[in-house]
């Protein structure tokens, strides 16, 4: 699987999940988020050669087409597959609020 366990431990040029740390205050200007200060959102990148974690028969065909026709612009894209939530703490006035935000962390990627 093209997940963090594999991708973060290997120098992989093809489609894989890449580490990306986002600091809420520094990177986004969101000063109101109390905890965490930031988190690993991660992202997917890298080419999608034939049969690499193909999501559908369409992406399999597209990957083969691109392999046989390297000059063609059509090829599968490396996109998130599994995402996990992130829990944040912030304050409304002096009242603490905890929110679980869905689909915040990319854990694995696929070619689609």
């Amino acid at each position: 699987a093209l997940d963090t366990n594999y991708c973060f431990r290997n120098l992989e040029e093809n489609c894989c999940v890449r580490p990306l740390y986002i600091d809420f205050r520094q990177d986004l200007g969101w000063k109101w988020v109390h905890e965490p200060k930031g988190y690993y959102a991660n992202f997917c990148s890298g080419p999608c050669p034939y049969l690499r974690s193909a999501d559908t028969t369409h992406s399999t065909v597209l990957g083969l087409y691109n392999t046989l026709n390297p000059e063609a612009s059509a090829s599968p894209c490396c996109v998130p597959q599994d995402l996990e939530p992130l829990t944040i703490l912030y304050y409304v006035g002096r009242t603490p609020k905890v929110e679980q935000l869905s689909n915040m962390v990319v854990k694995s990627c696929k070619c689609s």
């Epitope: 109101w32 006035g93 009242t95």
Partner: antibody, heavy 121, light 111 residues
Framework: EVQLVQSGAEVKKPGASVKVSCKTS????????MNWVRQAPGAGLDWMGQ????????NYNEMFEGRVTLTADTSTSTAYMELSSLRAGDIAVYYC??????????????WGQGTLVTVSS | DIVMTQTPPSLSVSPRETASISCRAS??????????MHWYLQKPGQSPQLLIY???NLESGVSDRFSGSGSGTDFTLRISRVEANDTGVYYC?????????FGQGTKLELK
């Protein structure tokens, strides 16, 4: 230039709902809390609630008894306020107002022009 | 809820004089070294505009004739050398506690 442009005046019957829009431009919509404030004729300002468009998180003023629903469309940078079970006491000008940015509850630095909602049978 | 009480309810001032508006909170609006109190002016037929942020910080583009002071529960907005353009209703607002609340307003007019 930051702009908040609200939808036009509404006339509704008692018991009905009204949905007011607030189209924004000139800043990154998902980065700031959007507040809604109402002002009854000749009266002061009442904070209704707020939404953080990036995540759809909301905080409401309990005085509106769950009659208010705030939503946001990030594709059009537009915020919406829907008020249900309208009554005569809801006749007011409704404002959207951008939060200053340092806190969830905060001062409001840019305001829409206001939308007058009239409730009449 | 924190109740914000403004005095006086209305104020008539001669041009070039100084106007003072008071705002008293029913409990302290201070936290973490800040006073979570702000001031707005609503001119006739217009939306409110932010004047003072966090008790004493002048908002960008606002005349330095406006100044804010105070901490805890007692706050003051001062307008020096009052002009015709300053007429309208002034509101204080706190955000130290949920829900956010406003004062009832002080109407400023020129003599």
């Amino acid at each position: 230039e930051v702009q908040l442009v609200q939808s036009g005046a509404e006339v509704k019957k008692p018991g009905a709902s009204v949905k007011v829009s607030c189209k924004t431009s000139g800043y990154t919509f998902i980065t700031y809390w959007m507040n809604w404030v109402r002002q009854a004729p000749g009266a002061g300002l009442d904070w209704m609630g707020q939404i953080f468009p990036a995540w759809g998180m909301t905080n409401y003023n309990e005085m509106f008894e769950g009659r208010v629903t705030l939503t946001a469309d990030t594709s059009t940078s537009t915020a919406y306020m829907e008020l249900s079970s309208l009554r005569a006491g809801d006749i007011a000008v409704y404002y959207c107002a951008r939060g200053y940015g340092n806190y969830a509850l905060d001062a409001m630095d840019y305001w829409g022009q206001g939308t007058l909602v009239t409730v009449s049978s | 809820d924190i109740v914000m009480t403004q005095t006086p309810p209305s104020l008539s001032v001669s041009p070039r004089e100084t106007a003072s508006i008071s705002c008293r909170a029913s409990e302290s609006v201070d936290s973490y070294g800040n006073s979570f109190m702000h001031w707005y002016l609503q001119k006739p037929g217009q939306s409110p505009q932010l004047l003072i942020y966090l008790a004493s910080n002048l908002e960008s583009g606002v005349s330095d004739r406006f100044s804010g002071s105070g901490s805890g529960t007692d706050f003051t907005l001062r307008i020096s050398r009052v002009e015709a353009n300053d007429t309208g209703v002034y509101y204080c607002q706190q955000n130290n506690e949920d829900p956010l609340t406003f004062g009832q307003g002080t109407k400023l007019e020129l003599k």
